[in-house]
Interface confidence: low
């Protein structure tokens, strides 16, 4: 690239001959005047490429003696107004002023866009004293300029509480287009329109944009930055980028992948974490989401039993966490479990089915036909019952628990008996005469104790009476 230095301030009055409007520091033979007495250089511009320095010369005005009141107004000399150069070049510019020697302690500060430049900047101030005046040249150099160096630079000098300000020097760093907004990756619905945005800036302006889809240009004619590309819809994944062009060349944005939303892949690795008599805790690993967030999942449960009707229970749950407690299951049953998840496009296929079993549970029904007799001759109570009738067992029956409560005036005592699973009768000793005995029976499995039967009461008289308690629950068919 060619580095340019353009002079756009008022022309120097002391240049012999016409001043060019634009000075190409790279390949133009530039004017150079000797440093004669009374003259000081006003501008030094140092390009990185070969070429002789440009030295503007400004006469320092004559002043009267130090005692005279007739001092000329102090002002910075005019210097170059506008410097245009390419990124990464070096630049040096200055401002100069002639100050009568009566003034002491003069300092020059540099400002950029209204803020003082402090610290580690390459600013050098040189003093050239003469009999009556001192020429002060403040130089400012920047190595390897960047876009952030663009701006308006001025010199300021304080004398006698007055501030003298130079004309601005505008630095314009030109380079390849710089993206301020690049297209973003997106997941889109198939055959649905969407927009991509690309914006790039110079200088130099203008910046023109070309769009590229899968390595092919989309627009024949460039669009001025910023550019919005409306894609009418895709049927398959595509990669888009944009090219930004200016006079310095071309910059290409990052390529962004536009994915087509699809139904998700089925979940994988369905696992059993915990089983109880009536619930199973499962987890799963979600499948690929099809470029669209999961909305919810469906847990499908089939009972694996030749006698079951093969119906599927469906439990809907949120997509996260990837865990669900399936409830309301039968005890001691085998189930086949699958998981499917959905996104905005639709449902995934079901995961591979896994087998799971519930554990033994407590019985769900009480024994039937509980009958209580008083066997007076033996001074005991005879209890009979029928095994609970259920279509399916909650577990292996291990026995029965008999509760008998004895109540007489002011006394109540509960006793518990356990009998084996093959029993359907039991005898208990009379605990108290002239009292009421209340009997309840529950079936017992390894999973726990089932519900107790309805209470059956029998009155135990003083010796000589007989009382008979009817069945608590009529057996089916025994009206």
């Amino acid at each position: 690239a060619i580095t340019e230095a353009r002079e756009e301030a008022k022309p120097y009055p002391l240049f012999p001959g016409p001043l060019p409007g634009s000075l190409q520091t790279d390949h133009t033979s530039l004017l150079s005047l000797p440093h004669t007495s009374g003259y000081q250089p006003a501008l030094m511009f140092s390009p990185t490429q070969p070429g002789r320095p440009y030295t503007g010369n400004v006469a320092i005005p004559r002043v009267t003696s130090a005692g005279s009141k007739l001092l000329p107004p102090l002002a910075f000399k005019h210097t170059v107004g506008h410097i245009i150069l390419s990124e990464h070049k070096d630049v040096k510019f200055n401002c100069s002023i002639s100050v009568p020697n009566i003034y002491q302690d003069t300092t020059i500060s540099w400002w950029k866009d209204g803020k003082e430049l402090l610290g580690a900047h390459h600013a050098i101030t040189q003093f050239y004293p003469d009999d009556e005046v001192t020429a002060i040249i403040a130089s400012f150099s920047i190595t390897s300029v960047q876009r952030s160096d663009n701006g308006s630079y001025i010199c300021k000098m304080k004398i006698n509480n007055e501030e003298i300000v130079s004309d601005p020097i505008y630095i314009e760093v030109q380079g390849l287009p710089h993206f301020t907004k690049q297209p973003e990756s997106m997941n889109v619905t198939r055959n649905t329109a969407f927009n991509l945005t690309c914006q790039a800036v110079g200088p130099p302006e203008p910046v023109n944009i070309f769009w590229v889809q899968n390595s092919s240009r989309v627009n024949e004619q460039p669009e001025k930055s910023p550019s919005v590309l409306t894609v009418p819809g895709l049927t398959e994944m595509a990669v888009f980028s944009c090219e930004a062009h200016n006079d310095k060349g071309l910059t290409v944005s990052k390529g962004v992948q536009i994915n087509i939303k699809a139904i998700p892949s089925p979940p994988t690795e369905v696992s059993i974490h915990n089983s109880t008599a009536h619930s199973i805790l499962i987890s799963w690993v979600p499948g690929f989401d099809g470029y669209s967030p999961f909305r919810n999942c469906s847990v499908q449960v089939k009972e694996v039993d030749p006698l079951s009707n093969g119906s599927v229970m469906i439990f809907n749950t949120s997509a996260s966490p990837h865990m669900y407690q399936i409830k309301q299951l039968q005890a001691l049953a085998n189930y086949s479990i699958g998981v499917s998840c959905m996104n905005e496009i639709g449902w995934s296929a079901v995961s591979p089915w896994i087998l799971a079993s519930t554990t033994e549970g407590a019985p769900s029904v009480a024994p039937l036909n509980v009958t209580v007799f008083l066997n007076e001759s033996r001074d005991n109570v005879d209890i009979r019952w029928m095994k609970p009738l259920t279509k399916r067992q909650a577990g292996e029956l291990v026995g029965y628990r008999i509760s008998h409560v004895w109540q007489s005036a002011g006394i109540s005592k509960e006793l518990l008996e356990e009998v084996g699973q093959n029993n359907s009768r039991a005898q208990i000793s009379v605990q108290v005469h002239n009292a009421t005995c209340t009997v309840r029976i529950a079936a017992v499995t390894k999973g726990g104790v089932g519900p107790f039967s309805d209470p059956v009461k029998i009155f135990i008289p003083a010796h000589g009476w007989v009382d008979h308690a009817p069945s608590s629950t009529p057996a089916p068919g025994n009206a």
Epitope: R190, T235, M237, A262, S265, F288
Partner: antibody
């Protein structure tokens, strides 16, 4: 369950055309692409193209462009492939497959295949 | 067109043996786009592994897949008689969708 039921074997003369069918069941027909794959005896599998039943969008393998035409009838959940200007090179088993969407493209279900014999 | 090269072309193995089939792609493919099929004699191909390493529904755990970039492989941990088939790799990254030429697995 998902099923793709293809039409029976065909014996046709060189230069003629033939239309093969593939009836889908057990899923929402318009959600997935239907693909067609060719397999010649002792040779590998060759993808012919797909059709997206929801809007009829088709994508062909350049090798089969102009020789194969894909179509669907959504009311009967049936996909069709017509092959034109047949030669002995077209003698093969043709499978219809369900495509698991185009940016991961794989074929999760396959029809049983239709045997096409081109002979004079 | 992405060309998939499978090797070996044929492999004979005894029951219980470990088998590895490789598939090399002519350009880099993300693992999401790489799949394997099994075709038993006289039957349609069947999806075996999708997205490089995910087992399709009903596929025994002795099958596994791995790979990235241009190199992918299918492994049968312990060969069984029912595994006699031709195995095909497939890429879903770009059209035309392409398959490998197949690896025929025979019983020794």
């Amino acid at each position: 369950q998902v099923q793709l039921q293809q039409s029976g074997p065909e014996l046709v003369k060189p230069g003629a055309s033939v239309r093969l069918s593939c009836k889908a069941s057990g899923y929402t027909f318009t959600t997935y692409d239907i693909n067609w794959v060719k397999q010649r005896p002792g040779l590998g599998l060759e993808w012919i193209g797909w059709i997206y039943p929801r809007d009829g969008y088709t994508k062909y393998n350049e090798k089969f462009k102009g020789r194969a035409t894909l179509a669907v009838d959504t009311s009967s959940s049936t996909a069709y492939m017509e092959l034109h200007s047949l030669t002995s090179e077209d003698s093969a088993v043709y499978f219809c497959t369900r495509g698991y969407y185009d940016n991961l493209y794989y074929f999760d279900y396959w029809g049983q295949g239709t045997t096409l014999t081109v002979s004079s | 067109e992405i060309v998939l090269t499978q090797s070996p072309t044929t492999v004979a193995a005894s029951p219980g043996e470990k088998i590895t089939i490789t598939c090399s792609a002519s350009s880099i493919i993300s693992s999401n786009y790489f799949h394997w099929y099994q075709q038993r004699p006289g039957f349609s191909p069947k999806l075996l592994i999708y997205r490089t390493s995910n087992l399709a529904s009903g596929v025994p755990a002795r099958f596994s897949g791995s790979g990235s970039g241009t190199s992918y492989s299918l492994t049968i941990g312990t060969m069984e008689a029912e595994d006699v088939a031709t195995y095909y790799c497939q890429q879903g990254r770009s059209v035309p969708l392409t398959f490998g030429a197949g690896t025929k697995l025979e019983l020794k």
